[in-house]
């Protein structure tokens, strides 16, 4: 045991030695030799029997975020939050777990993906599956009938995710919802406008927002001969049309879900259509569909929606798609989903979707499910699929080989000579107190070269250098890391000069 501990210590020391040599930019031969030694030490260490059984990893469908990934995430969140705030939203938060009863019966076939927690003193609890149901519970509990809010938090789904495509079991959702009784389609149009603003701002590529209405779907199923009990299950089949062919969907509906082939064919005639407002007009003339009250209401609202979307200047981004049948049970009206488009291989081909990056819709009955008297609070909202967006942004930055800053430090307080630690500490404290983002190296007498190197690696734009002479003269040498130009700045002017150079407001407002 003592021998293993000694060997582990040597592995640690050798690892430090290798890192040190690399930092010092030692000769390639020396580094190669010391790396070879490290590998030989590790080989002797072999597997630790006590640790062998336990593989150190994050649970399936989860991941850690490195500083680089966090920097990407912060930028994405910043774009989203600024947009939500621009549209006047307040922010709320809710517990990460809810009473199991709260989540039951809200998600249809997706309910099997809810994480249940072990017994917690008699309460049956589940991790939240989305942010919408907790929001509805919050409205009902607090008897709220009117709110525009956003909520950014992690949700949990016992999925079998393809993590390479930005799918996880624990992931962030960014939700924006408008609750309240308003004139038709105005809040819905604003939600679509927000979706388009965010996706455009993130510059992740061309996108298309598919729009449909639950009432149109339900009306269509009714006139095609689908029984009420099969509506939801047929919906989930139709929703797969963006991923698989109509033949496969039809086979599932007929073979697995017991639908008559002629009923499936009638559904196929409708759900394979997509277009703009002209398709809405066309369906309003459809002799069968226009006779269905629900479908007629849905089509009327969609016509109005397209008017507002034109006024918002986003009608070119919207496609009325009858195959959109989002799987969640709680939608009652307009539903929408944004997909990124891959550039077609040949001109004239249909644009190809590469997965949903945002979605939402109207859910007028959800709050009523929690109200003892069944009082309804109409709601409409959207959810941004940020995990997929993080993956896309990360891949794009890697492809461009862009260096991402993981800190916001504006200036490093450095010294050119020894025995100036006290002066550095005093100066860095002054800068912090003035709201400047500043750092110093945690060494008594760091070499100036090491300090400048640290700035280059961390992307710190400025170095405030203290020297014996500068102290006597009451100045600080301010050096630009990129241009390497140095100027003497009076100590009392330093804060202002740093703020001026880094474009920071001169007062902390």
């Amino acid at each position: 045991m003592a021998e293993r501990a000694a060997l582990e210590e040597l592995v640690k020391l050798q690892g430090e030695r290798v890192r040190g040599l690399k930092q010092q930019k030692a000769s390639a031969e020396l580094i190669e030799e010391e790396v070879a030694k490290l590998l030989k030490l590790k080989a002797q260490l072999g597997p630790d029997e006590s640790k062998q059984k336990f593989v150190l990893k994050t649970p399936k469908g989860t991941r850690d975020y490195s500083p680089r990934q966090m920097a990407v995430r912060e930028k994405v969140f910043d774009v989203i939050i600024r947009c939500f705030k621009r549209h006047g939203a307040e922010v709320i938060d809710t517990p990460v777990f809810e009473l199991k009863e709260t989540l039951m019966g809200k998600y249809g076939e997706d309910s099997k993906l809810i994480y249940d927690l072990k017994d917690q003193g008699g309460e049956l609890l589940s991790l939240r599956y989305d942010l919408t149901v907790p929001f509805a519970r919050y409205l009902a509990m607090n008897k709220l009938t009117n709110i525009k809010r956003y909520h950014i938090a992690k949700v949990y789904r016992r999925d079998n995710p393809a993590m390479t495509r930005g799918r996880y079991r624990e992931f962030y959702q960014c939700d924006f919802d408008i609750a309240g009784n308003f004139d038709p389609m105005i809040p819905d149009a604003e939600c679509l406008k927000i979706m388009c603003e965010i996706l455009s701002s993130l510059q992740i590529g061309d996108f298309l927002v598919k729009v449909n209405d639950r009432r149109i779907l339900d009306g269509m199923f009714a006139i095609c001969g689908v029984s009420d009990s099969k509506f939801r299950t047929i919906c989930s089949s139709v929703d797969k049309l963006d991923k698989v062919s109509w033949e496969e969907v039809k086979n599932e509906m007929v073979g697995e879900k017991g639908l008559a082939p002629e009923v499936a064919d009638r559904i196929g005639d409708y759900v394979q259509q997509h277009g703009g407002v002209s398709l809405v007009e066309q369906l309003l003339q459809d002799p069968k569909l226009s006779q269905n009250k629900q479908a007629l209401e849905g089509l009327g609202d969609l016509k109005l929606l397209f008017e507002y979307l034109t006024l918002f200047g986003i009608d070119d981004k919207i496609s009325f798609d009858l195959s959109l049948a989002r799987g969640l049970d709680y939608y009652t009206g307009v539903i929408y989903e944004a997909v990124l488009l891959q550039t077609p291989a040949q001109a004239g081909e249909e644009p190809l979707g590469v997965g949903s990056v945002a979605a939402g819709g109207r859910y007028d009955g959800l709050v009523g499910m929690f109200d003892p008297k069944g009082r309804k609070v109409p709601c409409v909202g959207l959810s941004i699929g940020v995990e997929r967006i993080f993956s896309i942004v990360e891949q794009r930055l890697e492809a461009l080989e862009e260096k991402i800053r993981t800190t916001e430090t504006q200036v490093l307080v450095a010294s050119a000579q020894k025995k100036l630690l006290e002066e550095r500490l005093k100066l860095v404290s002054e800068l912090w107190d003035a709201g400047i983002k500043a750092e110093l190296l945690y060494k008594k007498n760091p070499k100036l070269l090491n300090q400048l190197q640290y700035c280059e690696e961390a992307g710190i734009p400025l170095v405030a250098i203290i020297g014996e002479q500068e102290l006597k003269d009451g100045v600080i040498k301010l050096r630009s890391v990129t241009s390497r130009e140095e100027v003497d700045v009076r100590r009392e002017d330093l804060v202002e000069e740093i703020k001026r150079r880094t474009g920071q407001p001169l007062c902390i407002c």
Epitope: A6, E9, L13, E33, K40
Partner: antibody, heavy 120, light 107 residues
Framework: QVQLVESGGGLVKPGGSLRLSCAAS????????MTWIRQAPGKGLEWVSY????????NYADSVKGRFTISRDNAKNSLYLQMNSLRDEDTAVYFC?????????????WGQGTLVTVSS | DIQMTQSPSSVSASVGDRVTITCRAS??????LAWYQQKPGRAPKLLIF???SLQSGVPSRFSGSGSGTHFTLTISSLQPEDFATYYC?????????FGQGTKLEIK
């Protein structure tokens, strides 16, 4: 048993040459870095040279660089030190030693030493 | 080169005494330090490596501590067979250097 045995020491005139050998037994010789360390009479220890198990890496103290050559024959479990242009100050007991944990520059097994005397 | 300085050069002590020998490096060597014992006409014997790890077969009365530039070898209760010369050695960078030695004599 695990041991190192040096041989080849003796009296040699300044400018002369000598070849020291070190026979290893009881361990997998080719896995270990090996080293020559010397000790002048009544003095301290000085690291002379080392060689890695694969022959790939060697190094020499400045005092012997260009005059001494370290080598090994893994098939024969033997380490060698070829000493040319010998000087008075090379007079010492020469120890061969193996590195602790194969690659760490600390001698955990030493030979008994062989005396080299350089004198006219 | 890294210089290693041992103190004292010699020390007199009796059986049962606690003895401490110090070794200083001219620059930081982390824990890359070994202690050896050498008896007249014999090869050095490794006692401690990595500053504080006891070599297999060495009695537990020997212990090492320190890191950076300051290291100590302690013999908690001297035994008759412990009277010898002790050397420290840095294994941080080549040329690997030894201290000048500390002779432990019977009082």
């Amino acid at each position: 048993q695990v041991q190192l045995v040096e041989s080849g020491g003796g009296l040699v005139k300044p400018g002369g040459s000598l070849r020291l050998s070190c026979a290893a037994s009881g361990f997998t010789f080719s896995d270990y870095y090996m080293t020559w360390i010397r000790q002048a009479p009544g003095k301290g220890l000085e690291w002379v040279s080392y060689i890695s198990g694969s022959f790939r890496y060697t190094n020499y103290a400045d005092s012997v660089k260009g005059r001494f050559t370290i080598s090994r024959d893994n098939a024969k479990n033997s380490l060698y030190l070829q000493m040319n242009s010998l000087r008075d100050e090379d007079t010492a007991v020469y120890f061969c030693a193996r590195y602790v944990y194969q690659v760490v520059a600390i001698g955990d097994l030493w030979g008994q030493g062989t005396l080299v005397t350089v004198s006219s | 080169d890294i210089q290693m300085t041992q103190s004292p050069s010699s020390v007199s002590a009796s059986v049962g005494d606690r003895v401490t020998i110090t070794c200083r490096a001219s620059q930081g060597i982390s824990s890359w330090l070994a202690w050896y014992q050498q008896k007249p006409g014999r090869a050095p014997k490794l006692l401690i490596f990595a500053a504080s790890s006891l070599q297999s077969g060495v009695p537990s009365r020997f212990s090492g501590s320190g890191s950076g530039t300051h290291f100590t070898l302690t013999i908690s209760s001297l035994q008759p067979e412990d009277f010898a010369t002790y050397y420290c050695q840095q294994a941080k960078s080549f040329p690997y250097t030894f201290g000048q030695g500390t002779k432990l004599e019977i009082k």
